[in-house]
Interface confidence: low
């Protein structure tokens, strides 16, 4: 049933999904509806290399979470890449972060009960002017 | 129960959350656990202005979705901002997009049944070198 990449045996300590007193719960259909025609836009996927603030993508895997795999961006440089290919350290490459919703198995290993969780992920990098404090 | 910012009356056509035959469903506790101590980092939120590929944030609201409010980034310029404040059109500001999970009320207006949905959102913008096609 659960599309979290693993098959987990039913745990006798798991809450009953038919329990009316289950705290603050709703039924969620995991048959995902995808509103995007392309799930992994190639055009976005090469920005990490073409950006003036390029980044690497690191795989973050957690079988107790849905989705179990999340890709985290890590800026390659402290500075930003100039047209000549050199790094300009008067600018900073910084991660653009976003809070996303994931489902966390709770209690752990239960195949049919989750808690909604917010996590902060780095999606890519952008080049910013550093904060400069002028001394009077 | 549902933290979607609206109170929706119970619809007689809603599936019963105790129904064992509810398709591919799990119980989800909506009492969100936030793994981040700060939900709206000031540091991230001023990048939209300091970036060489600055962006504006547009509010996307949908009461049938959880979260009901999502902020979408729209790049301000086609090009990228240079140190002198002018726009360099030899470079491109592009949106960094990420697929996120949201909960969509299904059937509509039901307070306790959702379908997991993937949507593509623009989180911010980055400055990239355009793809140049050389004609032989």
């Amino acid at each position: 049933i659960v599309k979290a990449g693993i098959a987990i045996p039913r745990n006798s300590g798991c809450p009953n999904s038919e329990d009316k007193n289950f705290p603050r719960t709703v039924m969620v259909n995991l048959n995902i509806h995808n509103r995007n025609t392309s799930t992994n836009p190639k055009r976005s996927s090469d920005y990490y290399n073409r950006s003036t603030s390029p980044w690497n993508l690191h795989r973050n895997e957690d079988p107790e979470r849905y989705p179990s795999v999340i890709w985290e961006a890590k800026c390659r440089h402290l500075g930003c890449v100039k047209a000549d290919g050199n790094v300009d350290y008067h600018m900073n490459s910084v991660p653009i972060q976003q809070e996303i919703l994931v489902l966390r198995r709770e209690p752990r290993h239960c195949p049919n009960s989750f808690r909604l969780e917010k996590i902060l992920v780095s999606v890519g990098c952008t080049c910013v002017t550093p904060i400069v404090h002028h001394v009077a | 129960i549902v933290k979607a910012g609206i109170a929706i009356p119970r619809n007689s056509g809603c599936p019963n959350s105790e129904d064992k035959n509810f398709p591919r469903t799990v119980m989800v506790n909506l009492n969100i656990h936030n793994r981040n101590t700060s939900t709206n980092p000031k540091r991230s939120s001023d990048y939209y202005n300091r970036s060489t590929s600055p962006w504006n944030l547009h509010r996307n609201e949908d009461p049938e979705r959880y979260p009901s409010v999502i902020w979408e980034a729209k790049c301000r310029h086609l090009g990228c901002v240079k140190a002198d404040g002018n726009v360099d059109y030899h470079m491109n500001s592009v949106p960094i997009q990420q697929e996120i999970l949201v909960l969509r009320r299904e059937p509509r207006h039901c307070p306790n049944s959702f379908r997991l949905e993937k949507i593509l959102v623009s989180v911010g913008c980055t400055c990239v070198t355009p793809i140049v096609h050389h004609v032989a």
Epitope: R76, L78, V128 | T37, S38, P41, K42, R43
Partner: antibody, heavy 123, light 107 residues
Framework: EVQLVESGGGLVQPGRSLRLSCAAS????????MHWVRQAPGKGLEWVSG????????GYADSVKGRFTISRDNAKNSLYLQMNSLRAEDTALYYC????????????????WGQGTTVTVSS | EIVLTQSPATLSLSPGERATLSCRAS??????LAWYQQKPGQAPRLLIY???NRATGIPARFSGSGSGTDFTLTISSLEPEDFAVYYC?????????FGQGTKLEIK
């Protein structure tokens, strides 16, 4: 002058707690991530913990995870390290260090260091 | 975690000579490598970041090179104040790790 001054070290028995403080001056504290790095007597450097500008991202070395807690008070320009369940192997000189990037996030290259405060765990 | 191995453990040279210190990573760290100098009784001092960039106020005789797994810190002409312990540090993978250090001593 950019300066970091650590305090709070001392002699403590195994299993007890200690709280280190680091007072920052000469720079805008909340523009930078901060770190604690330690050095056992006669040994090399070991990164202990780091915290980004707004406490939204926090990290610990495996050796201290679950026992140490890093925090910061931007209004007071101060960084803290709460050390619980101390062990003999925690004996070290503890340095407070400033991250290099004025972006508030982690880069882990540290360009300003305090002089350190000594923690000795012994019965 | 990534292990950084520095060599040699001790380097004995005279003022005016060229010093070459090595740092090898157990896996690629791209260019995410920094070098620090530490003198007895003092805090470490950042010399080089991102493998080859001198930190503010660092003399031009210090230079860094390398990428991937092999890195070098070069001091072109040793000054008396350069004799100290030098550490490399990677920020490519969590947690950030330091090498065990190279002691540069006067011959």
């Amino acid at each position: 002058e950019v300066q970091l001054v650590e305090s709070g070290g001392g002699l403590v028995q195994p299993g007890r707690s200690l709280r280190l403080s680091c007072a920052a001056s000469g720079f805008t504290f909340d523009d930078f991530a901060m770190h604690w790095v330690r050095q056992a007597p006669g040994k090399g450097l070991e990164w202990v913990s780091g915290i980004n500008w707004n406490s939204g991202s926090i990290g610990y070395a495996d050796s201290v995870k679950g026992r140490f807690t890093i925090s910061r008070d931007n209004a007071k320009n101060s960084l803290y390290l709460q050390m619980n369940s101390l062990r003999a192997e925690d004996t070290a000189l503890y340095y407070c260090a400033k991250d290099i990037a004025a972006a508030g996030e982690f880069y882990f290259d540290m360009d300003v260091w305090g002089q350190g405060t000594t923690v000795t765990v012994s019965s | 975690e990534i292990v950084l191995t520095q060599s040699p453990a001790t380097l004995s040279l005279s003022p005016g000579e060229r010093a070459t210190l090595s740092c090898r990573a157990s896996q690629s760290v791209s260019s995410y490598l920094a070098w620090y100098q530490q003198k007895p009784g003092q805090a470490p001092r950042l010399l080089i970041y991102d493998a080859s960039n001198r930190a503010t106020g660092i003399p031009a005789r210090f230079s860094g090179s390398g990428s991937g797994t092999d890195f070098t810190l070069t001091i072109s002409s040793l000054e008396p104040e350069d004799f100290a312990v030098y550490y490399c540090q990677q920020r490519s993978n969590w947690p950030p790790t330091f090498g065990q250090g190279t002691k540069l001593e006067i011959k």
